[in-house]
């Protein structure tokens, strides 16, 4: 079972640098479109951070689709050599906190939250249900945790630690969950399946964080949330690697998970979309 193959990956303390995309469409999911042709194309996978092959149906789809691997790399990857490797402490807000609110192109209007850089606080906004950008949070708390400054000049980082602006010392921040487990996948992997507002019955997969497996559900065709994948493989790739167990300073090691119905602290995989 491919699910089990992913269980024991070693993750070191020096993680990948934050992903800075040259174009926002590089963050789109691979979309084969409604047609039935079998055409080899390439897309940029934000989770593996590399260009990968997929089968395109020949019509519609989105801009994250390239004729060749080279074209994909040229459009969606940068030379990483001159980038500073991210340490475990994130001292600044993610880039996406500074993006303007983006309702997207759909019309299943729902309430979401974004960080308003003018007012320096998280606010609600009217989201259309699809696309937009990453300055988009399901809850006020999530928005505040990721984008707002903490009290007394602290910047709260994604790992439950505060950086004291005065002397750069680390102050542990109390959390509601045992610090032994953390979720380092996208936060939407923890959301329930959401059919959305339309009347279609599309076969999709969502990640069930209680049982730790990707499960099928029927999608209405619009609205819903981002825990929504066209294939089980895509769902697993995005969400299955999320739970990790922290062990000493030597690193982080993936464990075979026995899931409990407990709240988990979210630490985003940073995907910073830069519109050029």
């Amino acid at each position: 079972d491919s699910e089990e193959d992913e269980e024991h990956t070693i993750i070191t303390d020096t993680e990948l640098p934050p992903l800075k995309l040259m174009h926002s469409f590089c963050a789109f999911k691979a979309d084969d479109g409604p047609c039935k042709a079998i055409m080899k194309r390439f897309f940029f996978n934000i989770f593996t951070r590399q260009c990968e092959e997929f089968i395109y149906g020949g019509c519609e789809g989105n801009q994250n689709r390239f004729e060749s691997l080279e074209e994909c790399k040229k459009m969606c990857t940068r030379d990483n050599a001159n980038r500073i490797i991210k340490t475990t402490l994130q001292q600044e807000k993610p880039d996406f906190c500074f993006l303007e609110e983006d309702p997207g192109i759909c019309r299943g209007y729902i309430t979401r939250y974004f960080y308003n850089n003018q007012t320096k606080q998280c606010e609600r906004f009217k989201y259309g249900g699809c696309l937009g950008n990453m300055n988009n949070f399901e809850t006020l708390e999530e928005c505040k945790n990721i984008c707002e400054d903490g009290p007394n000049g602290f910047q709260v980082d994604n790992y439950g630690t505060q950086l004291n602006a005065v002397n750069n010392s680390l102050t542990p921040q109390s959390t509601k969950v045992p610090s032994l487990f953390e979720f380092h996948g996208p936060s939407w992997c923890l959301t329930p399946a959401d059919r959305g507002l339309c009347r279609a019955n599309e076969n999709r997969f969502y990640y069930n964080s209680v049982i730790g497996k990707c499960r099928p559900f029927k999608y209405s065709g619009c609205g819903g949330n981002e825990n929504n994948f066209t294939s089980k493989q895509e769902c697993l790739r995005a969400c299955k690697k999320g739970f990790i167990q922290r062990i000493s300073k030597g690193g982080l090691i993936k464990t075979k998970r026995k899931r409990k119905k407990q709240r988990v602290k979210i630490a985003y995989e940073e995907i910073f979309v830069k519109n050029m």
């Epitope: 309430t111 308003n116 003018q118 007012t119 606080q121 998280c122 609600r124 006020l140 507002l197």
Partner: antibody, heavy 119, light 108 residues
């Protein structure tokens, strides 16, 4: 003390337009959303739309998008709602109400403006 | 849009009795985004309960709110004369924001 004071009653003919005002005081006008809600005689409440005066962000109920125009004057802390192409079913009490930027708890309301549309 | 249906339309009870007002949504809404307002004749509505169960400032403890998904309830444990009014449920999970048609709580 937070206060929302609305303009006086209006009598209009079908097809005409009406512009209602809501003057805010006792709080920072630009830091809150201002909503417009109407109530037809003996009926429930109907949300028309909202405006956040600082950045001019506006959300309309699609039902009113072509006929309602929400504006705000920051210098006088006054919100306005103009409703065009009036018909008899627009006869209602129109309220302004404020809410914070994080939720839609309409914690302060104006006294209401009665608009009567009759030929 | 989300349609909120309140029942009963009118509830006739005596002071001291228990009142249960229901609000049913056409689609599931987040409990955080379900509010209640009270309105008395000739007055503007007043915020009464936010986030399904959080009483607004000045609301007596005999009021309580509960529910999730599509079913929400406002309960008054023992009616006082000042409780007789119209109560509206309100959702802001989806746009446009919508209100129920109201339940009129009248003295029997």
């Amino acid at each position: 003390e937070v206060q929302l004071v609305q303009s006086g009653a209006e009598l209009k003919k079908p097809g005409a337009s009406v512009k209602l005002s809501c003057k805010a005081s006792g709080y920072t006008f630009t830091s809150y959303w201002m909503h417009w809600v109407r109530q037809a005689p003996g009926q429930g409440l109907e949300w028309i739309g909202e405006i956040k005066p600082d950045q001019g962000r506006i959300n309309y109920n699609e039902k009113f998008k072509t006929r309602a125009t929400l504006t705000a004057d920051k210098s006088t802390s006054t919100a306005y709602m103009e409703l065009s192409s009036l018909r008899s079913e627009d006869t209602a009490v129109y309220y302004c109400a404020r809410s914070s930027v994080v939720d839609v708890a309409m914690d302060y309301w104006g006294q209401g403006t009665t608009v009567t549309v009759s030929s | 849009e989300i349609v909120l249906t309140q029942s009963p339309a009118t509830l006739s009870l005596s002071p001291g009795e228990r009142a249960t007002l229901s609000c049913s949504a056409s689609s599931s809404v987040s409990s955080s985004y379900l509010y209640w307002y009270q309105q008395k004749p000739g007055q503007a509505p007043r915020l009464w309960i936010s986030g399904t169960s959080i009483l607004a400032s000045g609301v007596p403890a005999r009021f309580s709110g509960s529910g999730s998904g599509t079913k929400y309830t406002l309960t008054i444990s023992s009616l006082e004369p000042e409780d007789f009014a119209v109560y509206f449920c309100h959702q802001w999970s989806y746009y446009p924001f919508t209100f129920g048609q109201g339940t009129k709580l009248e003295i029997k």
